[in-house]
């Protein structure tokens, strides 16, 4: 059974992930980003189901494409280079989903824009956090 300290750690990691995803969304989804329209042409694959931490496997698999899109943005949009930002997110995702169980991600038929993709994972984080508090 999860201890209160492990629950607290999970909550903090989710909050960190949430803030990173929100920062990316705010950095790209505004009219001051001249590459927004170009970024919206990139396809992202969405999870068929995202209700548990193991489903973060689906996010992990889309981090490389996410980095490619973020490379189009000006560095001033974020406080870190895309490579470092994605690396940080990857570390959190690996810790949260755990590496001891292998989970095969199932993707939905519908693809999404980067904005829809980020909003989906932001909602996921918020949902899990709410169950922990």
């Amino acid at each position: 059974a999860p201890t209160s300290s492990s629950t607290k750690k999970t909550q903090l990691q989710l909050e960190h992930l949430l803030l990173d995803l929100q920062m990316i969304l705010n950095g790209i989804n505004n009219y001051k980003n001249p590459k927004l329209t170009r970024m919206l042409t990139f396809k992202f694959y969405m999870p068929k189901k995202a209700t548990e931490l193991k489903h973060l496997q689906c996010l992990e698999e889309e981090l490389k494409p996410l980095e490619e899109v973020l490379n189009l943005a000006q560095s001033k949009n974020f406080h870190l280079r895309p490579r470092d930002l994605i690396s940080n997110i990857n570390v959190i995702v690996l810790e949260l989903k755990g590496s001891e169980t292998t989970f095969m991600c199932e993707y939905a038929d519908e693809t999404a824009t980067i904005v829809e993709f980020l909003n989906r994972w932001i909602t996921f984080c918020q949902s899990i956090i709410s169950t922990l508090t």
Epitope: Y31, P34, T37, R38, L40, F42, T111, T113
Partner: antibody
């Protein structure tokens, strides 16, 4: 209604210059990145250049880099394309086009203006 | 350089289904968009993000994408659908806009 009205086309000799204008109305011009797209007679569409909402960032197709300059005057709601060292292959209908902020394409186009480069 | 490949022309009778293809290596990771351009007019967006239809575009226009191929379908083509159709996307790396060569649709 949302509109882009173009002016400034015409016939020009190779090596000479020409400036196109695109007047925007019906939307907050300063909130949108803008583009120029061209179409040679009987041919397909070719993206030419993009300018950011405030004019600070500009991107060009390789075919016009160093010869064409895009600019904007947000106080006049107007987009410009300065074309220098014109070549016969620049002969085309030139369209100004607005970048959509919600989908990855151009959502509003000007009526087009013909530029003919000929001696 | 990256290219989007379309058939140059297609002819259908009124009421028939017109299917226009667009091939691009990046389509598994890029959305396809479709513009209609009638003679002497500016292009009009008829499909975005592979399958979505802008408001005001008739339901007979639909889009799909699978692998490296995007498709525009006009179910029950009408005489007023006669136009050039261009697929559009962006390059895989720098994401500069790119158009297909266009398909001239004749409805007669």
């Amino acid at each position: 209604q949302v509109q882009l009205v173009q002016s400034g086309g015409g016939v020009v000799q190779p090596g000479r210059s020409l400036r196109l204008s695109c007047a925007a109305s019906g939307f907050t011009f300063s909130n949108y990145a803008m583009n120029w797209v061209r179409q040679a007679p009987g041919k397909g569409l070719e993206w030419v250049t993009l300018i950011s909402y405030d004019g600070s960032q500009k991107y060009y197709a390789d075919s016009v880099k160093g010869r064409f300059t895009t600019s904007r005057d947000n106080s006049k709601n107007t987009l410009y394309l300065q074309m220098n060292s014109l070549r016969a292959e620049d002969t085309a209908v030139y369209y100004c086009a607005r970048d959509s902020t919600t989908l990855g394409a151009f959502d509003v186009w000007g009526q087009g203006t013909m530029v003919t480069v000929s001696s | 350089s990256y290219e989007l490949t379309q058939p140059p022309s297609l002819s259908v009778s009124p009421g028939q289904t017109a299917t226009i293809s667009c091939s691009g290596d990046a389509f598994p990771r890029k959305f396809a968009y479709w513009y209609q351009q009638k003679s002497g007019q500016a292009p009009v967006l008829v499909i975005y993000e592979d399958t979505r239809r802008p408001s005001g575009i008739p339901e007979r226009f639909s889009g799909s994408s699978s692998g490296t191929m995007a498709t525009l379908t006009i179910s029950g083509a009408q005489v007023e659908d006669e136009a050039d159709y261009f697929c559009y996307s962006t390059e895989p790396t720098v994401a500069h806009p790119i158009f297909g060569g266009g398909t001239k649709l004749t409805v007669l």
